[in-house]
């Protein structure tokens, strides 16, 4: 299934993009999945469809649910699903985990924090930024286009950062906020030839046909901030984005973790609705930095659904 999670706060604007793509000339219809009722396109409605976008202006808790989008080409229809959850505003300062976008890491050399989902909205600079609910003040903080730059980053700069902006729709203004965590990487350290912790070389992973499967590529690169380090998956020697199989996707953003003081990265490969042909592919976990590249190959094998042992 082509499904995407989206969330927002009540009385704020929320704009969701259809997970299925198409050409500009294709029409897109939106429906409430439960009732199959068409979502209007007239902008006078609080919830309305605008091509590939579904707009909640503003959102209400009752809007939560699954929405279906159908991208109609002249000869074929592509269906996607948007799983939308609208939450009540919290009275206290804490932003719950379910409202957080992906964590970003920064260092003294690179301290950009991008405002999540902002590209979907009609907004004008400047953005307002808050850290742990306090408005950011001082010359160290610079709001630039859709991101925040922090000069001379220190470990104390770690925390939850919220961007706030105004979406304009036909002269009406709606507030939008989005929060993500920012972690600070230690500048002191060293770099090693990548060490892949998982998967093992030539590992065989058992999967069930028709079910979802996850493969994690995890590697460590040294201690402290790494100038260049990446982990990624390849299919038959091809980047995931170039392979063109929408069921197989890398998890957005790399997770940074520190194991025994080591700087490690992991990338999850998600395979939706495993098919027979997926068993024929070669899955390569690649870890690379300035020292070089290490590759571990994984293959999938069919797991008998009634076979419960690990």
């Amino acid at each position: 299934k082509f499904s995407k999670q989206s969330w927002g706060l009540e009385n704020e604007a929320l704009i969701v993009r259809c997970p299925r793509q198409g050409k500009p000339s294709y029409t897109v219809d939106w429906y409430y999945s439960q009732t199959n009722k068409s979502i209007p396109t007239q902008e006078r409605n609080r919830v309305f469809a605008s091509g590939q976008l579904l707009k909640f202006l503003p959102a209400a808790v009752a809007d939560s649910g699954i929405y279906t989008c159908i991208v109609r080409s002249p000869t074929f229809n592509r269906t996607g699903y948007a799983n939308v959850t609208i939450y009540k505003k919290q009275s206290d300062c804490n932003v719950p985990d379910y409202l957080m976008y992906s964590t970003v890491s920064g260092s003294e050399k690179n301290s950009k924090i991008y405002c999540p989902t902002i590209d979907l909205y009609n907004w004008t600079a400047p953005l307002e930024w808050f850290k742990n609910c306090q408005a950011l003040q001082g010359s160290r903080y610079r709001a630039h286009k859709s991101f925040l730059v922090i000069d001379n980053v220190m470990t104390e700069d770690a925390g939850d950062y919220t961007c706030k902006f105004i979406h304009n729709e036909n002269g009406a203004n709606y507030s939008v906020t989005a929060t993500r965590s920012f972690t600070v990487k230690d500048e002191q350290g060293f770099s090693l030839f990548p060490v892949i912790g998982a998967p093992a070389q030539n590992e065989i992973k058992e999967v069930e046909i028709g079910k979802n499967a996850n493969l994690t590529c995890s590697a460590c690169f040294g201690k402290g901030t790494q100038f260049l380090a990446a982990v990624l998956w390849q299919l038959n020697g091809t980047k995931i984005t170039d392979f063109g199989e929408p069921r197989i996707q890398q998890e957005e953003g790399q997770n940074q973790s520190f194991s025994n003081g080591l700087a490690c990265l992991d990338m999850v490969l998600r395979i939706a609705d495993v098919k027979e042909e997926d068993l024929l592919l070669q899955y390569d976990c690649l870890a690379l930095n300035l020292h070089g590249l290490r590759r571990h190959t994984v293959r999938l094998s069919r797991k008998n659904p009634i076979d419960h042992h690990s």
Partner: antibody, heavy 120, light 111 residues
Framework: QVTLKESGPTLVKPTQTLTLTCTFS??????????VGWIRQPPGKALEWLAH???????QYNPALKSRLTITKDTSKSQVVLTMTNMDPVDTATYYC????????????WGQGTTVTVSS | DIVLTQSPASLAVSPGQRATITCRAS??????????MQWYQQKPGQPPKLLIY???NVESGVPARFSGSGSGTDFTLTINPVEANDTANYYC?????????FGQGTKLEIK
């Protein structure tokens, strides 16, 4: 610069399976909206659409030939492969691959074509 | 299937004159207000070349002498003025429904 090139056997025997490869450059079949199709033209006759495949692996076939056709893509190699089973002398034709690009659905770039003769 | 009927089957035109080829579809090729009809030129030993897309849009690099018109089921390709190197077969093609279909072709000869 967009280019497409067809390759495959020039002669096949009746009942055999024909496998044609279209190798392209100048665009990616992972780009939203892109497609690659196959068209054939018997000597002195009109063009006939066979099949095409889209960026998201949606495949469409000519219903008259669907049972005999399979189209696949290898995005990493920039290739699209068409197989046609149970070949017959009436399948003798020049086979073209073409890109479906632009804001609408049509063939905007064509390969030079490859001539396939079916004969025992 | 949508059947495309071209007329005439062949025509001969003097240089500098106008050539008109028509294509009639067995049903409408309209989609969201757009006519999904193309015109291709094919010279001997060469692949087809796109001239006109969605009924009236001239493909980049194609001389302005070529124009397309029509909507629904009736479409026209006009070449004005005709030049000696326009000798070729011309095909209309619809992409409104699968199977995509082509006309039987019109052979243009220059007198």
């Amino acid at each position: 610069q967009v280019t497409l090139k067809e390759s495959g056997p020039t002669l096949v025997k009746p009942t055999q399976t024909l496998t044609l490869t279209c190798t392209f450059s100048g665009f990616s079949l992972s780009t939203s909206g892109m497609g690659v199709g196959w068209i054939r033209q018997p000597p002195g006759k009109a063009l006939e659409w066979l099949a095409h495949i889209w960026w998201d692996d949606v495949k469409q076939y000519n219903p008259a030939l669907k049972s005999r056709l399979t189209i696949t893509k290898d995005t990493s190699k920039s290739q699209v492969v068409l197989t046609m089973t149970n070949m017959d002398p009436v399948d003798t034709a020049t086979y073209y691959c073409a890109r479906i690009g632009g804001d609408y659905d049509y063939f905007d770039f064509w390969g030079q074509g490859t001539t396939v003769t079916v004969s025992s | 299937d949508i059947v495309l009927t071209q007329s005439p089957a062949s025509l001969a035109v003097s240089p500098g004159q106008r050539a008109t080829i028509t294509c009639r579809a067995s049903e409408s090729v309209e989609y969201s207000g757009t006519s999904l009809m193309q015109w291709y030129q094919q010279k001997p030993g060469q692949p087809p070349k796109l001239l006109i897309y969605v009924a009236s849009n001239v493909e980049s690099g194609v001389p302005a002498r070529f124009s397309g018109s029509g909507s629904g089921t009736d479409f026209t390709l006009t070449i004005n003025p005709v030049e000696a190197n326009d000798t070729a077969n011309y095909y209309c093609q619809q992409s409104r429904k699968v199977p995509w279909t082509f006309g039987q072709g019109t052979k243009l000869e220059i007198k």
